[in-house]
């Protein structure tokens, strides 16, 4: 913690501004009042303070809302988000996406994944759920982003937002997330043709389960290979070597190449030999 | 060893119903879709309805979509075949069958259903 | 939907006759066609899928071949057993649908 000492009545703040960048640590601790400070937060990030005087402004602001900052204040943080804990954000009750835009431009080029992450379910939490909005402005501003919520908070998404949602939205998505997005997806995409469907759900297939990967098999999509590497393990093993074949279509050939890769291989070692061998790939259980 | 039973058909009158139960053993049913083909007094064959091994999907020709509905239980090893509004044309022997992928793999011996006044 | 019809609708043939029976889908439907053997009174049994795979236990003097839109199902040596209706279906996609059926009769 900085030590207090009193203000030189020279040094005395009756504004912030661009003054300040001269005042040393102890004097910026001792001369700038804090509700002064949280009032004219959106002068803040055009002032170059160093990051030490950073410190001493988050200090002031920590104390002034020790149960966490209002959304007047976080709005105009600036560069001072970067000195952001996920244990401080945490505390915060954010509901503007226009915070969230200004939030997610500072923390771009910086490694801020934790606070970030922590910013986007404290947004979901004080909206009440992922809206079509919330998604538009992740999608734009954090692509990527939209896997750092947890699976409780992504059960929040209404499945009419799901077309909002782009493949590489969900490329850091983990089996448990996509478990959650999958049937929202489905249901999202449920009127849609085969083919049409298929290029729209097949972002989601991670979460699919072993009944919906073979009703796709009646749809001549013809998976590619990297989607179904995707699958989860548990869906691929009860496919048939017919489903599988039926699955994947022209693309049935790169079975061979991933053969020794999940979830290929341990389907590969669930079929009977006889099975394999009507593929015609050379591939052995 | 796959065996497939059916049972339930039987003279029914132009507009009436019929169910049709299929009794599976010798492999996990609860893995497969199953369908129902039929086929008519000396012709050919016709696939009537496929439903998925969890029962979420069927599938349907034009010519029974609307009045043939499949179902299955899986706690019992059982496929039906609900059959309502049946018509004459609907006359044939329908036949259980396990399908694997694209494939009819194993076939019931088939029940007689006749249409007629 | 994807029409399959075969030909001939019905042979004559002795014993140890090699016999072939056509095919023809309507549209490309790849390898995804299957034959069926009918015996009168008895339910089909799968002979061949994916065009010329043997189903199990099936004897190796049933073959199938061709792609696309033409298939064969070729019976090399025609052994007593054999007399029935054959059919074929194709499984590319739905509705899946059958030929009317070639009938393999003693000469």
């Known amino acids: 913690d900085v030590e207090r000492t009193t203000c030189p009545p020279e040094k005395e703040v009756h504004e912030i501004d661009e003054n300040l960048i001269f005042y040393k640590k102890r004097e910026l601790e001792a001369c700038v009042d804090a509700a002064l400070l949280a009032a004219q937060m959106d002068r803040v990030d055009a002032i170059p303070f160093t990051y030490e005087q950073l410190d001493v402004l988050k200090h002031k602001l920590d104390e002034l809302y020790p149960q966490g900052y209002p959304e007047s204040v976080i709005r105009h943080l600036g560069h001072l988000f970067l000195k952001m804990s996920p244990e401080d954000i945490r505390k915060w009750n954010v509901t503007s996406l226009e915070t969230l835009k200004a939030l997610l431009k500072v923390s771009k080029g910086h490694e801020m994944s934790a606070q970030v992450a922590t910013l986007i379910d404290r947004v979901v939490v004080g909206r009440g759920q992922l809206d079509k909005d919330t998604v538009d402005t992740l999608t734009a501003f954090c692509p990527g982003c939209l896997c750092s919520l947890s699976p409780e908070r992504l059960s929040s998404v209404p499945p009419s937002v799901i077309g909002a949602v782009r493949p590489q939205d969900l490329d850091t998505c983990g089996p448990r997330q996509l478990d959650v997005l999958y049937p929202k997806a489905r249901l999202a995409f449920q009127n849609m043709s085969g083919s049409e469907y298929f290029v729209k759900i097949r972002p989601f297939l991670g979460g699919a389960p072993t009944e919906d990967l073979k009703a796709l098999s009646q749809q001549n999509v013809s998976m590619d290979l990297a989607t179904f590497m995707k699958l989860r393990r548990e869906a691929v093993l009860p496919l048939t070597v017919a489903e599988v074949q039926k699955l994947l279509g022209p693309h049935v050939e790169g079975l061979k190449v991933e053969e020794q890769h999940s979830p290929v291989r341990d389907w590969i070692l669930k079929q009977r030999q006889d099975d394999l061998d009507t593929l015609g790939l050379g591939l052995q259980g | 060893e796959v065996q497939l039973v059916e049972s339930g058909g039987g003279l029914v009158q132009p507009g009436g119903s019929l169910r049709l139960s299929c009794a599976a053993s010798?492999?996990?049913?609860?893995?497969?879709?199953m369908s129902w083909v039929r086929q008519a007094p000396g012709k050919g064959l016709e696939w009537v309805a496929t439903?998925?091994?969890?029962?979420?999907?069927?599938y349907y020709p034009d010519s029974v979509k609307g009045r043939f509905t499949i179902s299955r239980d899986n706690s019992k090893n059982t496929l039906y075949l609900q059959m309502n509004s049946l018509r004459a044309e609907d006359t044939a022997v329908y036949y259980c069958?396990?399908?694997?992928?694209?494939?009819?793999?194993?076939w019931g011996q088939g029940t007689l259903v006749t249409v007629s006044s | 939907d994807i029409q399959m019809t075969q030909s001939p609708s019905s042979l004559s043939a002795s014993v140890g006759d090699r016999v072939t029976i056509t095919c023809r889908a309507s549209?490309?439907?790849?390898?995804?066609l299957n034959w069926y053997q009918q015996k009168p009174g008895k339910a089909p049994k799968l002979l061949i899928y994916?065009?010329?795979r043997l189903h199990s236990g099936v004897p190796s003097r049933f073959s199938g071949s061709g792609s696309g839109t033409d298939f064969t199902l070729t019976i090399s040596s025609l052994q007593p057993e054999d007399f029935a209706t054959y059919y074929c279906?194709?499984?590319?996609?739905?509705?899946?649908?059958f030929g009317q059926g070639t009938k393999v009769e003693i000469k």
């Open positions: 010798g492999f996990t049913f609860s893995d497969y879709f």
């Open positions: 439903i998925s091994n969890g029962g979420t999907y069927t």
């Open positions: 279906q194709q499984g590319n996609t739905l509705p899946y649908t």
């Open positions: 994916y065009t010329s």
């Open positions: 069958a396990r399908f694997d992928g694209y494939i009819f793999d194993y």
């Open positions: 549209q490309d439907i790849s390898n995804y």
